[in-house]
């Protein structure tokens, strides 16, 4: 048993039929010694008397809010949650496996730049009695601070008759050094509580591996005289790290016909302009990627070849 927060405790249980469970001793937080009784949740049934209560926790019926009283007055509470371990593996019932980029991916994270700010999100089919708490650090043995906000419901996703709820959280490394080579990964830990079930989920990554720039901005076309060619120009996205001479992007320029089946012409460049042939009814799209590290490409910015 361990304390999750004040007056909230997690009991770790091996979960199999006829498991013996865990013996837990609860102590009433009071200077009183005599006339103390214990109840569970809203029941008025007295479970025991005295300053301590010893219980055998085997199943969810044994979890809940234990309250000690004296003469009709509440003295203190202890909320017991269960963390299930089946065949040596902690349960992952609360969150949905996103299966991207690999199986058993419960948390996904992205950063738009090297500032130390990143966003993580997760999915669940559970709509009520659900709370999340997020902690993060760089490294685990001598952790450096990362501050995370509160997890919020960012989207509800409906697929047929099924609903999924997407939660997201924004975190910021306290003393980020954008230009430094990362040697220790960021660790993100999410505590999830559904009713009386506790689970925890973790993700470990380097910021450089979760970078996804915003699309290039101010994409413009300038026709070249007496030619079917156009000069395409664009700018670095506002959210990208500066100076751009150090935090450089590379770009992919694509000419795409109206139909997705049409052949695409692609040009790769480190500059913020390129010359391409504009076909009728085609569009020109540009996306960006870190020039020196192969993390994700941005989404496309597009303009029509009109």
């Amino acid at each position: 048993i361990w304390e999750l927060k004040k007056d909230v405790y997690v009991v770790e249980l091996d979960w199999y039929p006829d498991a013996p469970g865990e013996m837990v001793v609860l102590t009433c937080d009071t200077p009183e010694e005599d006339g103390i009784t214990w109840t569970l949740d809203q029941s008025s049934e007295v479970l025991g008397s005295g300053k301590t209560l010893t219980i055998q926790v085997k199943e969810f019926g044994d979890a809940g809010q234990y309250t000690c009283h004296k003469g009709g007055e509440v003295l203190s509470h202890s909320l017991l949650l269960l963390h299930k371990k089946e065949d040596g593996i902690w349960s992952t019932d609360i969150l949905k496996d996103q299966k991207e980029p690999k199986n058993k991916t419960f948390l996904r994270c992205e950063a738009k730049n090297y500032s130390g700010r990143f966003t993580c999100w997760w999915l669940t089919t559970i709509s009520t009695d659900l709370t999340f708490s997020v902690k993060s650090s760089r490294g685990s043995s001598d952790p450096q601070g990362v501050t995370c906000g509160a997890a919020t419901l960012s989207a509800e996703r409906v697929r047929g008759d099924n609903k999924e709820y997407e939660y997201s959280v924004e975190c910021q490394e306290d003393s980020a050094c954008p230009a430094a080579e990362e040697s220790l990964p960021i660790e993100v830990m999410v505590d999830a509580v559904h009713k009386l079930k506790y689970e925890n989920y973790t993700s470990s990554f380097f910021i450089r591996d979760i970078i996804k720039p915003d699309p290039p901005k101010n994409l413009q076309l300038k026709p070249l005289k007496n030619s079917r060619q156009v000069e395409v120009s664009w700018e670095y996205p506002d959210t990208w790290s500066t100076p751009h001479s150090y935090f450089s992007l590379t770009f992919c320029v694509q000419v795409q016909g109206k139909s997705k089946r049409e052949k695409k012409d692609r040009v790769f460049t480190d500059k913020t302009s390129a010359t391409v042939i504009c076909r009728k009814n085609a569009s020109i799209s540009v996306r960006a990627q870190d020039r020196y590290y192969s993390s994700s490409w941005s989404e496309w910015a597009s303009v029509p070849c009109s």
Partner: nanobody
Framework: EVQLVESGGGLVPPGGSLRLSCAAS????????MSWVRRAPGRGLEWISS????????HVAGSVRGRFTISRDNAKNTLYLQMNSLKPDDTAVYYC???????????????????RGQGTQVTVSS
């Protein structure tokens, strides 16, 4: 040429309803996820709702959950946003935007888009 033309905005009292439409042309509408985003006075762009190319998956922001419903008619090349129980906080210019692909983008990418319309003003006031 890709064109997205929104309509259906206007002045509505708190608690009222509006239905926004977005007529799309110049591309294969049924191949792309579509979204609604909005910009309130003095605020940044806020993602509202998205729908996959075949309507099998819809996403709606937590802030409008239970009040706004996105839908599309691929035969008519039209995207819709049904807005019920409107609040003064919903006052904004609403834009129809084309996503990058047939699926809804990740949370960090939802206010990014390939193309967007000129927008339609929604004002919620008594």
């Amino acid at each position: 040429e890709v064109q997205l033309v929104e309509s259906g905005g206007g002045l509505v009292p708190p608690g009222g309803s509006l239905r926004l439409s977005c007529a799309a042309s110049g591309f294969t509408f049924s191949s792309y996820a579509m979204s609604w985003v909005r910009r309130a006075p003095g605020r940044g762009l806020e993602w509202i709702s998205s729908i996959s190319s075949g309507s099998d998956t819809t996403h709606v922001a937590g802030s409008v959950r239970g009040r706004f419903t996105i839908s599309r008619d691929n035969a008519k090349n039209t995207l819709y946003l049904q807005m019920n129980s409107l609040k003064p906080d919903d006052t904004a210019v609403y834009y129809c935007v084309r996503a990058y692909d047939s699926i809804v983008p990740s949370p960090t990418q939802r206010t990014n888009y390939e193309y967007r319309g000129q927008g339609t003003q929604v004002t919620v006031s008594s």
